[in-house]
């Protein structure tokens, strides 16, 4: 299984996001919250340190609304 100690960078990170999110797309940074004025971004969270599936999923684009 995926070990959270591993990091994901470059093409490997992009391919992994496509696998996790499907073709709906993903963001490299999330909107900053009111608590933290600065959004970290997925490169900082998954390339400079380790991340897991749950964290990767937070960068997926929001699917279009159901009809």
């Amino acid at each position: 299984a995926y070990r959270p100690s591993e990091t994901l960078c470059g093409g490997e990170l992009v391919d992994t996001l496509q696998f996790v999110c499907g073709d709906r797309g993903f963001y490299f940074s999330r909107p900053a919250s009111r608590v933290s004025r600065r959004s970290r971004g997925i490169v900082e969270e998954c390339c400079f340190r380790s991340c897991d599936l749950a964290l990767l999923e937070t960068y997926c684009a929001t699917p279009a609304k159901s009809e």
Epitope: Y2, F19, C21, D23, R24, P63, A64
Partner: antibody, heavy 120, light 107 residues
């Protein structure tokens, strides 16, 4: 071109588990994401989940979460799908399907399927 | 989950006919639909990806169209080897889902 090879058939008792294998040959295992798709007799296709073998990152369909485990062994270029608590409704052909990394779900490569029959 | 609804569920046609199979998604999915052909006892085969791109090695008599929620697979002139079951698939958002299939039979 990667070829995905599966074993022919398994017969299992209700309540037991089955582990189906999918061996890649003739290409680069690392360039693919592997999904597992099942097809009950005369029915449609159902995606169970998938894995990026080189990273071990796994995504499951909610329906199977907790009952299915997908793994991969990089050293033998083999992916596995284990399904537990089998019932008669799990009788199906189980396919492994490969999609190129970055296009994980464009299944351009399929194993020949493993028929799993659940019967007492 | 995104539901994919195919119609018709079965279709009878003759060699040389032009046939169209339709697939509707329960929500807008841009152009992220694939089409597969499956023959009895065999694994599915990818024909069309991203709604309209022809997979390498697939005959040009197969074509795909559509975007949003409505998609179509057209076979311009049916050949004997085209009688099979066809499935649509959405890749927009996991869990990946398929249509229930359209069985194309010889009239």
């Amino acid at each position: 071109q990667v070829q995905l090879q599966q074993l022919g058939a398994e017969v299992k008792m209700p309540g037991s588990s089955v582990k189906v294998s999918c061996k890649a040959s003739g290409g680069t295992f690392s360039s693919y994401a592997i999904s597992w798709v099942r097809q009950a007799p005369g029915q449609g296709l159902e995606w169970m989940g998938g894995i990026i073998p080189t990273l071990g990152i796994v995504k499951y369909a909610q329906k199977f979460q907790g009952r299915v485990t997908i793994t991969a062994d990089k050293s033998t270029s083999t992916a596995y799908m284990e399904l537990s608590s089998l019932g008669s409704e799990d009788t199906a052909v189980y396919y492994c399907a490969g999609g190129p990394r970055g296009y994980s779900y464009n299944f351009d490569n399929w194993g020949q399927g493993t028929l799993v029959t659940v019967s007492s | 989950d995104i539901q994919m609804t195919q119609s018709p569920s079965s279709l009878s046609a003759s060699v040389g006919d032009r046939v169209t199979i339709v697939c509707r998604a329960s929500q807008t999915i841009s152009r992220y639909v694939n089409w597969y052909q499956q023959k009895p006892g065999k694994a599915p085969k990818l024909l069309i990806y991203a709604a309209s791109s022809l997979q390498s090695g697939v005959s040009s008599r197969f074509s795909g169209s559509g975007s949003g929620t409505e998609f179509a697979l057209t076979i311009s002139s049916l050949q004997p080897e085209d009688f099979a079951t066809y499935f649509c698939q959405q890749t927009y958002s996991p869990p990946i889902t398929f249509g229930q299939g359209t069985r194309l039979e010889i009239k």
